[in-house]
């Protein structure tokens, strides 16, 4: 059945702690993303963001998470109004930022 | 335009060794994994293992203690080496990227005959 | 492994009619709510295609004649109606768990 909210939330946070501890070298490569509006539709947003990196092993597992959180398809390419569009940041950086603020929602309650 | 292009030995004597190069264009080997796939005369296709952008390589298990696959991102090039060859190892060879997210496989070489033989 | 069984091994289809695939796998290929199963075309003597990814998503340049649909361990692929080209060997193939696997192969012959 559907993960629920909070578990949800919870094995992101996991995977995203696991990824900022396991860094050596740059992430992905040093590819560069779309910072987002950390605010509403923010699976969707970021997940539109990470889908535009292929070929990173580190963030599949994100990827994976991301799209099952998102309830439309999204693809690469594909951009929308929660994007900061005159921003791009690394990798590894939009990774610490989304850390950041899922632990803060976890915190709060704010599963959805 | 993405290509990818295959070069082989063609004829390889049993218990010898393979090595079979992808050299691809269109896109950079640090943005995108390339995978090793094979297919016997008149058979299905066989995932051989894989070699990520980011470096990171995965093998399949039946076949890890006799392949090894290494890229060099400078000369767009992937390499596949496979050792200890025996006469089922005659297999047409592919490299074939994988797209975007969900890393399905989207273009393929045309693919190299190799054939395992005295 | 994923052990993937596409049945059946070989068919023949009228022009104009449907061709139906189907790709059942040893344990379910569901992760997150999507379904990691594709679907390829081989032509004679030449590599595979991607005609479908994640169970039901056309590939881009692929005819909507082709359609996928399936979950967890039950997967079909569609072609309707079935065109002279159309004459090839399809695969399924999933990247839920390594080692990737393909299924092996259903032949499509046009009557």
């Known amino acids: 059945g559907p993960v629920p909210p909070s578990t949800a939330l919870r094995e992101l946070i996991e995977e995203l702690v696991n990824i900022t501890q396991n860094q050596k070298a740059p992430l992905c490569n040093g590819s560069m993303v779309w910072s987002i509006n950390l605010t509403a539709g923010m699976y969707c947003a970021a997940l539109e963001s990470l889908i535009n990196v292929s070929g990173c092993s580190a963030i599949e597992k994100t990827q994976r998470m991301l799209s099952g959180f998102c309830p439309h398809k999204v693809s690469a390419g594909q951009f929308s109004s929660l994007h900061v569009r005159d921003t791009k940041i690394e990798v590894a950086q939009f990774v610490k930022d989304l850390l950041l603020h899922l632990k803060k929602l976890f915190r709060e309650g704010q599963f959805n | 335009e993405v290509q990818l292009k295959e070069s082989g030995p063609g004829l390889v004597a049993p218990g010898g060794s393979l090595s079979i190069t992808c050299t691809v264009s269109g896109f950079s080997l640090t943005d995108s994994s390339i995978n090793w796939v094979r297919q016997p005369p008149g058979k299905g296709l066989e995932w051989l293992g894989m070699?990520?952008?980011?470096?990171?390589?995965d093998y399949n298990d039946a076949l890890k203690s006799r392949l090894s696959i290494s890229k060099d991102n400078s000369k767009s090039q992937v390499f596949l080496e496979m050792n200890s060859l025996r006469t089922d190892d005659t297999a047409t060879y592919y490299c074939?990227?994988?797209?975007?997210?969900?890393?399905?496989?989207?273009?393929w070489g045309q693919g190299t005959s190799v054939t395992v033989s005295s | 492994d994923i052990v993937l069984t596409q049945s059946p091994a070989s068919l023949a289809v009228s022009l104009g009619q449907r061709a139906t695939i189907s790709c059942r796998a040893s344990?379910?290929?569901?992760?997150?709510?999507?379904?990691?199963m594709h679907w390829y075309q081989q032509k004679a003597g030449q590599p595979p295609k991607l005609l479908i990814y994640?169970?039901?998503n056309l590939e881009s340049g692929v005819p909507a004649r082709f359609s996928g649909s399936g979950s967890r361990t039950d997967f079909t692929l569609t072609i309707d109606p079935v065109q002279a080209e159309d004459a090839a060997t399809y695969y399924c193939?999933?990247?839920?768990?390594?080692?990737?696997?393909f299924g092996g192969g259903t032949k499509l012959e046009i009557k």
């Open positions: 193939q999933q990247n839920n768990e390594d080692p990737r696997t």
């Open positions: 344990e379910s290929v569901d992760s997150y709510g999507n379904s990691y």
């Open positions: 070699i990520w952008g980011d470096g990171r390589i």
């Open positions: 994640l169970a039901s």
């Open positions: 074939a990227r994988d797209g975007y997210f969900p890393y399905a496989m989207d273009f």
